[in-house]
């Protein structure tokens, strides 16, 4: 995967007037890195791992740049003509990448009320827009405004591309992105499903990078996909990720089943535990309702491994 730096800025308008302040998030190699949420914000690292390596100068520079970008984006939103009553958002996403062969990519995307309406390749300076008439109207509106703004010249777009890459290279050089690996904590629980059956759930948390294999095995052999249910791999707010896999098995056959985990070249297997039964409300149902596990995770008896 290429190294990447992604800037995501959002500004809001309410009933025709642009609100002060903006929201900015910066992701480095897909990890939340900086966050800034008021006009006079101070960019903060998302997670200790970044703060340890990069000093205050970095935050000062990023804060200054993000604040300037936020102002530009607010001015752009003010010029969008179809402001109606209610809340509206304008979002700018800027991404630059450095690939293994040292080639680079940079792009910029604009979204109005969450809908993409304008993209630009910052290297070729080529603009593209979706086919819908609303998107095209918005795109022409914004492009015209950007052209009017003396700052938005060829030089400006080239600088945006160069600056993003310069920052990315600076971060890579600083060692903040050492392709670090953090192994997961794996926890297996069991819960009553229906008469004669139990549901076993294997959770992996606190791992980085996000790529992981998590599956149930019976007698050492992977169960078929249709007999397992997976949760999404989600950020856990600490610069690491979490996920889960569950399957339903016959009570009394627990010894046959193990959870197999593979991550960054390391692997482990985890048996189904036996232990005390606790009744608890699981938070997992809120995040993973679309996996059809509501019935399993709502009020469940879980045996915790002692």
């Amino acid at each position: 995967e290429p190294h990447s730096l992604r800037y995501n800025l959002t500004v809001l308008s309410g009933d025709g007037s642009v609100q002060s302040g903006f929201l900015a998030e910066v992701h480095l190699d897909g990890q939340p890195f900086l966050r800034c949420d008021r006009q006079k914000c101070r960019a903060k690292p998302q997670g200790q791992w970044a703060e340890d390596v990069l000093g205050n100068k970095t935050w000062d520079r990023e804060t200054r740049d993000l604040t300037g970008n936020g102002k530009d984006l607010r001015m752009t939103l003010a010029h969008i003509k179809d402001q109606k009553e209610g809340l509206h958002s304008l979002q700018e996403i800027r991404v630059c990448e450095i690939h293994e062969d040292n080639s680079t990519r940079s792009s910029q995307h604009f979204y109005y009320d969450g809908e993409l309406f304008l993209s630009q390749n910052l290297e070729t300076e080529e603009w593209t827009m979706p086919q819908s008439s609303r998107a095209q109207t918005l795109a022409m509106n914004v492009r015209n405004f950007l052209k009017e703004d003396a700052m938005k010249t060829k030089t400006h777009y080239h600088a945006m591309h160069a600056d993003c890459l310069q920052e990315l290279r600076r971060y890579l050089k600083s060692g903040v992105v050492l392709r670090r690996t953090v192994p997961p904590m794996v926890n297996v629980t069991r819960s009553e499903a229906s008469e004669g059956n139990i549901t076993v759930t294997c959770r992996a948390s606190g791992f980085y990078p996000w790529n992981i294999t998590l599956s149930w095995r019976q007698d050492g052999v992977s169960l078929s996909h249709d007999t397992q249910q997976w949760g999404d791999v989600l950020p856990d707010g600490n610069g690491t990720y979490q996920t889960w896999v569950a399957t339903r098995i016959c009570q009394g056959e627990e010894q046959r089943f193990t959870c197999y985990m593979e991550h960054s070249g390391n692997h482990s297997t985890h048996p189904v535990p036996s232990g005390k039964v606790l009744v608890l409300q699981s938070h997992w149902q809120h995040h993973h309702h679309h996996h059809g596990l509501n019935d399993i995770f709502e009020a469940q008896k879980i045996e915790w491994h002692e």
């Epitope: 095995r217 019976q218 007698d219 050492g220 052999v221 992977s222 056959e253 046959r256 193990t258 197999y260 692997h267 482990s268 297997t269 048996p271």
Partner: antibody
Framework: QVQLQQSGPELVKPGASVKVSCKAS????????IYWVKQSHGKSLEWIGY????????VYNQKFKGKATLTVDKSSSTAYMHLNSLTSEDSAVYYC???????????WGQGTLVTVSA | DIQMTQTTSSLSASLGDRVTITCSAG??????LNWYQQKPDGTVKLLIF???SLQSGVPSRFSGSGSGADYSLTISNLEPEDIATYYC?????????FGAGTKLELK
């Protein structure tokens, strides 16, 4: 490629014990279970049990509990089966096998002949 | 324990023949059935897993089918190297059990 190399034939006296080894190569040893199977002369195959080399967890066929003990040495990628209190009924060829994670007994060792005789 | 029955203990066939070996389980096993080949020198090889999935490297003349408690292995065009004993094995329930084997011989 995956290979399972078993120890040579054994001639043992009744009441004694024997340890059959199975050295694995060509894959990450702790990734996949090692299974053990018995084949008495001219007879069919019988599953003895299996071991997870990662954590040493074992599952046995009830019939062989107390007769066979499965262990592994991760440092040498070798699985062992210890058979105790041998009788003529234990005379057989013993196979180790492993999996590719998708099917049981995917790869087999060449077999070890154990003969129990006074 | 689930009893696996291979009613035909030995079977004679000619080269090029289509040969079918059957196996029946003492109860339904949900397609959790494998087929193995054991050569006269004792070498054992997995042919088919999960009733009908051909193991990598196994010639396509081998195929498996069945459901419930009844299963079969078919060799569509018998070759000299297919002379061996064939075993079915269930993994629906512990203990894992094998059939008694069907010895395939040349006519």
């Amino acid at each position: 490629q995956v290979q399972l190399q078993q120890s040579g034939p054994e001639l043992v006296k009744p009441g004694a014990s024997v340890k059959v080894s199975c050295k694995a190569s060509g894959y990450a040893f702790t990734k996949y279970n090692i299974y053990w199977v018995k084949q008495s002369h001219g007879k069919s195959l019988e599953w003895i049990g299996y071991i997870d080399p990662y954590n040493g967890g074992t599952v046995y066929n009830q019939k062989f509990k107390g007769k066979a003990t499965l262990t592994v040495d991760k440092s040498s990628s070798t699985a062992y089966m210890h058979l105790n209190s041998l009788t003529s009924e234990d005379s057989a060829v013993y196979y180790c096998a492993t999996t590719d994670g998708y099917s049981l007994f995917t790869y087999w060792g060449q077999g070890t002949l154990v003969t129990v005789s006074a | 324990d689930i009893q696996m029955t291979q009613t035909t203990s030995s079977l004679s066939a000619s080269l090029g023949d289509r040969v079918t070996i059957t196996c029946s389980a003492g109860q339904g096993i949900n397609n959790y059935l494998n087929w193995y080949q054991q050569k006269p020198d004792g070498t054992v090889k997995l042919l088919i897993f999960y009733t009908s999935s051909l193991q990598s490297g196994v010639p396509s003349r081998f195929s498996g089918s069945g459901s419930g408690a009844d299963y079969s292995l078919t060799i569509s065009n018998l070759e000299p190297e297919d002379i061996a004993t064939y075993y079915c094995q269930q993994y629906s329930k512990l203990p894992l059990t094998f059939g008694a084997g069907t010895k395939l011989e040349l006519k």
